[in-house]
């Protein structure tokens, strides 16, 4: 086949090689860009910048090599459109630095930067960490900083990500209140900061105020939905990004719902309780306190991370007619109490006509040290015989 006369020539089924001296000064309009998985560029001294627009449309790119060229600057967002990039070779260019943001979000198996006049500063602390942790084949390159010695020897004591402190109200927050949060940002070379409020939705009206180094956030007219929702403050500098999340506890009274008993492997009287702070619970059976044992006890389902409501069961193991009756769940917190009752019938009384039959509702010699109110948290399995029953 005749040699390819173009600046860039196909290489394999989805590769492109651009090696003709000085033919490129940008990567716009590369032929067949959308299907490329491999791009090899060499001897392009006019190619000095790599920016977001340069790699637009290269969504399938996995290997990018730009070597022995004039690359001086790679934009922090240069690889935004190439999320599948796994090998990046930028050796023997004119790079003095490379932002941590450039590689953030990529799963690079290999990053080659040897032969660049790197300048040791906190902006390369991330690369030093890669070297320390053996990532991306960096240690093998024995990277040097121009006139400063090995990257590995760069002092890094002062190279920290920003420090964040979020102040939340000490006092109890009630539904309808306005809440002021303040995020104090400290650190060198602060670049950007802000709030992430994606979880809040309709939980409050949001007003942002201030800027670095002190960001304010007012949550107006809060609802109980704000509970368990993360409010996150973030800040970035040349070393990296820091985030701190807080939650605002909005007090509201206990509420409770009971549902009809269902037979699974054991019997379950399903319930839901809500309230902030989390309510203490107590069960009554036919009006008397029900002492929990391994035969009858409260079992919570795994809670949803972002809501206060808890779902669970009063688990009854092998219940008989003596367990038939009225079950009441009492829930209380400092802001109110609630109760719900339900009748449950597990088995007909086989001795209905014999009033002499003993009914073992409880066995008095057992001392129950009930820490009633402490939630019994259900973990990741629903064991068949764990549970619960004769009253």
């Amino acid at each position: 086949a005749a040699p390819c006369p173009d600046a860039c020539c196909p290489h394999g089924s989805s590769g492109l090689r651009c090696t003709r001296d000085g033919a490129l000064d940008s990567l716009h309009h590369l032929p067949g860009a959308e299907n490329l998985t491999e791009l090899y560029i060499e001897n392009q001294q006019h190619l000095q910048h790599l920016e977001l627009r340069d790699l637009r449309g290269l969504g399938e790119l996995r290997n990018l090599t730009i070597v022995k060229s004039g690359l001086r600057f790679v934009a922090p967002d240069a690889f935004h459109f190439t999320p599948r990039l796994s090998r990046l070779n930028l050796s023997f260019n004119a790079l003095e630095s490379l932002s941590w943001k450039t590689v953030q979000g990529l799963s690079l198996q290999e990053l080659v930067l040897s032969g660049n006049p790197l300048h040791c500063s906190c902006a390369l602390r991330w690369l030093q960490r890669w070297e320390e942790e053996g990532l991306g084949g960096v240690p093998e390159q024995k990277l040097q900083c121009h006139g400063q010695g090995p990257l590995a020897h760069m002092p890094n004591a002062s190279c920290g990500v920003p420090t964040l402190k979020v102040q939340v109200p000490n006092a109890s927050v009630d539904v309808g209140d306005d809440v002021l949060l303040r995020c104090q940002v400290e650190g060198r070379g602060l670049e950007q900061a802000g709030w992430i409020l994606t979880e809040l939705e309709q939980s409050a009206t949001v007003m942002k105020s201030g800027g670095l180094p002190s960001l304010g956030l007012t949550l107006a007219n809060v609802t109980s939905d704000l509970n368990r929702k993360n409010v996150t403050c973030w800040a970035e500098n040349d070393v990296g990004r820091a985030e701190v999340s807080v939650q605002v506890n909005v007090s509201f009274p206990a509420s409770v719902q009971l549902h009809t008993a269902v037979e699974m492997h054991h019997w379950c009287i399903p319930f839901s309780v809500d309230g902030q702070p989390a309510p203490s619970l107590r069960w009554l059976f036919n009006g008397s306190v029900l002492n929990e044992t391994s035969f009858i006890f409260t079992e919570f389902l795994e809670p949803a991370a972002n809501e206060t409501v808890r779902h669970g069961c009063l688990r009854l193991n092998q219940p008989t007619h003596v367990n038939n009756g009225n079950y009441t769940l009492l829930a209380a917190n400092p802001f109110g109490q609630a109760s719900a009752s339900i009748m449950a019938a597990f088995m007909d009384n086989p001795f209905e006509f014999n009033p002499e039959d003993p009914i073992p509702v409880s066995f008095s010699p057992v001392d129950t040290n009930s820490t009633s109110g402490d939630p019994v948290e259900k973990k990741d399995e629903t064991p068949f015989g764990v549970s619960v029953a004769v009253g």
């Epitope: 044992t293 006890f297 040290n369």
Partner: antibody, heavy 118, light 107 residues
């Protein structure tokens, strides 16, 4: 697989206390109550009590109410039984046990032999 | 408490024999009864729960029966590994109680 690990033996003096451990593995610790059973040499089995690993709720048989104290360390998946004011009558093997898929003791520890002797 | 009374206290038999151990509850426990086998120096092992359900891995020569207050465990065609002490236990609420045991010895 489910395991309940107990130390083999404890030698204690009369009047002293001893804490027995039962380390659970192979299942979700907080999903099953832990029970303790006493067996004196050459004698039968005697249920002492039970504890809910989630919230520390305990039930004891009357005669062990002032003798045994059951506790839990969720962080290490370990149940403990403290026996106090020991007398020679407390010399026995103490087992921890848990229910299987039904309320019967499908899983037992190896037992800890407690010897009370001056 | 529910008292569990086991009989006989001891029993001698030969390999191949069939034996029956009985257990009486002081009150109605429906079918909530378990049987355990224990060998010298070992932990008890669950054989049967809910009167007649064999635990995992238990050979079919073991069978349980009964309800209410009267229960029995039958072992057909005794094997050398069957000798030991057998306990019944109710699982009808706490406190849980065991029978005093039946020692099955080789004749």
């Amino acid at each position: 697989q489910v395991q309940l690990q107990q130390p083999g033996a404890e030698l204690v003096k009369p009047g002293a206390s001893v804490q027995l451990s039962c380390k659970a593995s192979g299942y979700t610790f907080t999903s099953y109550w832990i029970h303790w059973v006493k067996q004196r040499p050459g004698q039968g089995l005697e249920w002492i009590g039970e504890i809910n690993p989630n919230n520390g709720l305990t039930n004891y048989i009357e005669k062990f109410k002032n003798k045994a104290t059951l506790t839990i360390d969720k962080s290490s998946n370990t149940a403990y039984m403290q026996l106090s004011g020991l007398t020679p009558e407390d010399s026995a093997v103490y087992y921890c046990a848990k229910y299987g898929n039904y309320v019967a003791f499908a899983y037992w520890g190896q037992g800890t032999l407690v010897t009370v002797s001056a | 408490d529910i008292q569990m009374t086991q009989s006989p206290a001891s029993l001698s038999a030969s390999v191949g024999d069939t034996v029956t151990i009985t257990c009486r509850a002081s009150e109605n426990i429906y079918t909530y009864l378990a049987w355990y086998q224990q060998k010298q120096g070992k932990s008890p092992q669950l054989l049967v729960h809910n009167t007649k359900t064999l635990a995992e891995g238990v050979p079919s020569r073991f069978s349980g029966s009964g309800s209410g207050t009267q229960f029995s465990l039958k072992i057909s065609s005794l094997q050398p590994e069957d000798f030991g002490t057998y306990y019944c236990q109710h699982h009808y609420g706490v406190p849980l109680t065991f029978g005093a045991g039946t020692k099955l010895e080789l004749k």
